[in-house]
Every structure is written in structure tokens, then in C-alpha cells.
């Protein structure tokens, strides 16, 4: 899993997370968020 | 839960073929993502490929990529990874693990099952 780490006063750590499109809905594939700071975002 | 036997695993020469299987028993196997992860000697484990609860949906580690295949047969209980053009970085144990729907299927955490593993070993 990628992590990124920011040269500030605290480090974010940045994970991709990957979901299966059928499991939210009907379509096919992949859905890949971001996870930063324990938040996943589009 | 379900409970994971992981076979096929052995000795292969760099360009070679093999083709892991993975046994479920219970009757929640179509319930689970299904995935292959895998831990080179004094490595961690890390993603290799996954399929959807359907078989419909796959997704893989860009490191196999266009060389492994990832399958699922909901009738006869099995996951199946077919590797081809083998490498020696793929010499690993490999692990099949099943991840309940909506979790993230690229990571280690989400899978509440495991497999004991089958070692791969490519080397000439």
C-alpha cells in the first residue's frame, strides 16, 4: 500500500483503497478512493 | 466465516506456468471478494489480485498485471490464479483470503479469512 509522507509539522499518510463497483451498485470494476488521515475520499 | 486450502503451489522455471487454487467450505463463499496476496522471504504481505463476489469484477497488482489471471467458481466452492510468464520477484508464499463486501479488497485488514498458503518457488 503506497503511503506518502509530507515534510511539514505532522505527517498524512496517504493510502489507495480499491472497492468492487458491484457492491455499492450494478455496474462492473473497480472503484479506487484515497484514504487521508483515516478519511477516504474520492 | 469461511475456512480457506490453498494448492498448487511448487518449483517453476522463470517464464513458467502454474495455476494456485483456493477451497472454500461454507455456505457464504459467494458472500466474499475473494483475493491472492503473497509474502517474499523478510517481506510483507502484499496485494496480488481480486475478484468480485459475481466473478464478474477483477483487479490486480500492476507488478502481475497482463501475467496473472484471477478466477472464481461459485459452484464448486474455489478461487483460482492462473500465473503465467513467472519471474523469480514472484517467488513468495501465496495466500487466498476472503474479504466481506464493501471493503476495500486491496488491503491486508479487510480480509477476515485466510488460507495457510502455498509456497511458489521460480528460480532456473
Known amino acids: 500500500d503506497a503511503e506518502f509522507r509530507h515534510d511539514s509539522g505532522y505527517e498524512v499518510h496517504h493510502q489507495k483503497l480499491v472497492f468492487f463497483a458491484e457492491d455499492v451498485g450494478s455496474n462492473k470494476g473497480a472503484i479506487i478512493g484515497l484514504m487521508v488521515g483515516g478519511v477516504v475520499i474520492a | 466465516e469461511v475456512q480457506l486450502l490453498e494448492s498448487g503451489g511448487g518449483l517453476v522455471q522463470p517464464g513458467g506456468s502454474l495455476r494456485l487454487s483456493c477451497a472454500a467450505s461454507?455456505?457464504?463463499?459467494?458472500?466474499?471478494?475473494m483475493g491472492w496476496f503473497r509474502q517474499a522471504p523478510g517481506k510483507g504481505r502484499e496485494f496480488v489480485a481480486a475478484?468480485?463476489?459475481?466473478?464478474?469484477?477483477?483487479y490486480y497488482a500492476d507488478s502481475v498485471k497482463g501475467r496473472f489471471t484471477i478466477s472464481r467458481d461459485n459452484s464448486k466452492n474455489t478461487v483460482y490464479l492462473q500465473m503465467n510468464s513467472l519471474r523469480p520477484e514472484d517467488t513468495a508464499v501465496y495466500y487466498c483470503?476472503?474479504?466481506?463486501?464493501?471493503?476495500?479488497?486491496?488491503?491486508?485488514?479487510?480480509?477476515?479469512?485466510w488460507g495457510q498458503g502455498t509456497l511458489v518457488t521460480v528460480s532456473s
Open positions: 483470503g476472503a474479504a466481506y463486501r464493501g471493503t476495500a479488497i486491496n488491503v491486508r485488514r479487510s480480509y477476515s479469512s
Open positions: 461454507g455456505r457464504t463463499f459467494n458472500n466474499y471478494n
Open positions: 475478484v468480485s463476489r459475481s466473478g464478474v469484477s477483477t
